[in-house]
């Protein structure tokens, strides 16, 4: 079956938006007014993954770009990266595990746990203009909660 996808933007719980920082990195910063147009639009695809009552497997691509967030080991540490893919083959229902995040949603707050590295989450720093990264702690200084805004296709 073809994969189902929705376009959306994400903001962290401090209302920082996500923007491109160079070709293969995202950063989080506060945007206002016309600058909001800089924020990245994700294509959230609903993919196959492990069955769980409260976790929905998704892939996060950048709309109209052949880039997906993925989780890999770099220097023995789980790391978030933007990975280029062949647009003829993506998105697909059975995404490789490094592209899969378990969306955990409580009261419209979303967390994105790496399927490849359980208990590692898409995270932002408290500080402005810092890279979006994969963090291994929840409830600490770093931010792991996001809100989602729908975008028309």
């Amino acid at each position: 079956a073809p994969v189902r996808s929705l376009n959306c933007t994400l903001r962290d719980s401090q209302q920082k938006s996500l923007v491109m920082s160079g070709p293969y990195e995202l950063k989080a910063l506060h945007l206002q007014g016309q600058d909001m147009e800089q924020q990245v639009v994700f294509s959230m695809s609903f993919v196959q993954g492990e069955e769980s009552n409260d976790k929905i497997p998704v892939a996060l691509g950048l709309k109209e770009k052949n880039l997906y967030l993925s989780c890999v080991l770099k220097d023995d540490k789980p790391t978030l990266q933007l990975e280029s893919v062949d647009p003829k083959n993506y998105p697909k229902k059975k995404m490789e595990k490094r592209f899969v995040f378990n969306k955990i949603e409580i009261n419209n707050k979303l967390e994105f746990e790496s399927a490849q590295f359980p208990n590692w989450y898409i995270s932002t720093s408290q500080a402005e203009n810092m890279p979006v990264f994969l963090g291994g702690t929840k409830g600490g200084q770093d931010i792991t909660d996001f809100t989602m805004q729908f975008v028309s296709s």
């Epitope: 079956a1 376009n7 609903f46 929905i56 949603e105 729908f150």
Partner: antibody, heavy 120, light 107 residues
């Protein structure tokens, strides 16, 4: 609690149009697909299409393209389905239902149904 | 379109009986399978989603399972209020498709 309240029964002549409404309460309207399903007298259930009010995305059953037009008004938390060029075969009960935007929860809540009768 | 072949089309049973209704999907539906109960003149009522997850408020005598592309609804001990028509639904691929229905009658 979640409620979907549909508009009342309609009797229409062949060739006419009808617009059925589905007013929802008890949840965030923008985050749930509104599904439309029909049931002809004594028959089974048939999926017509869906709309996600949060972004206006619509998916139709090819069979109903050109027959059904699905819209949503986020200011009133109401979804609509208009049926055009009505024929006797369109006589049915039309239901709205909901499913969360990530498709996980199934068609959990249903409206009471709207009977549309097409007769000359 | 994905075909959902539901069987049996009708079934007679007694209060206390264990009954099973099956839907066979014509292709993989990634567990996007729901079951509904409908009584005459009423809207369908959701019982189960994602094959086996019970909707809040649905009695535990209802259960769902899967084996390959075969999906089963089981009622462990029929109660008088369970006599109705049951439908499966696949919502993995457009157009979403329902089974033809199983009418469960009192023997």
């Amino acid at each position: 609690q979640v409620q979907l309240v549909q508009s009342g029964a309609e009797v229409k002549k062949p060739g006419a149009s009808v617009k059925v409404s589905c007013k929802v309460s008890g949840y965030t309207f923008s985050r749930y697909w509104i599904e439309w399903v029909r049931q002809a007298p004594g028959k089974g259930l048939e999926w017509i299409g869906e709309i996600l009010p949060g972004n206006g995305n619509i998916n139709y059953n090819e069979k109903f393209k050109g027959k059904a037009t699905i819209t949503a008004d986020t200011s009133t938390d109401t979804a609509y389905m208009e049926l055009s060029s009505l024929r006797s075969e369109d006589t049915a009960v039309y239901y709205c239902s909901t499913i969360y935007y990530d498709y996980d929860q199934g068609f959990t809540y249903w409206g009471q149904g709207t009977l549309v009768t097409v007769s000359s | 379109d994905i075909q959902m072949t539901q069987s049996p089309s009708s079934l007679s049973a007694s209060v206390g009986d264990r009954v099973t209704i099956t839907c066979k999907a014509s292709q993989d539906i990634d567990r996007y399978l729901s079951w509904f109960q409908q009584k005459p003149g009423k809207a369908p009522k959701s019982l189960i989603y994602r094959v086996k997850r019970l909707v809040d408020g649905v009695p535990s005598r209802f259960s769902g399972s899967a084996s390959g592309t075969d999906y089963t609804l089981t009622i462990s001990s029929l109660q008088p209020e369970d006599f109705a028509t049951y439908y499966c639904l696949q919502y993995d691929e457009f157009p979403y498709t329902f089974g033809q229905g199983t009418k469960l009658e009192i023997k």
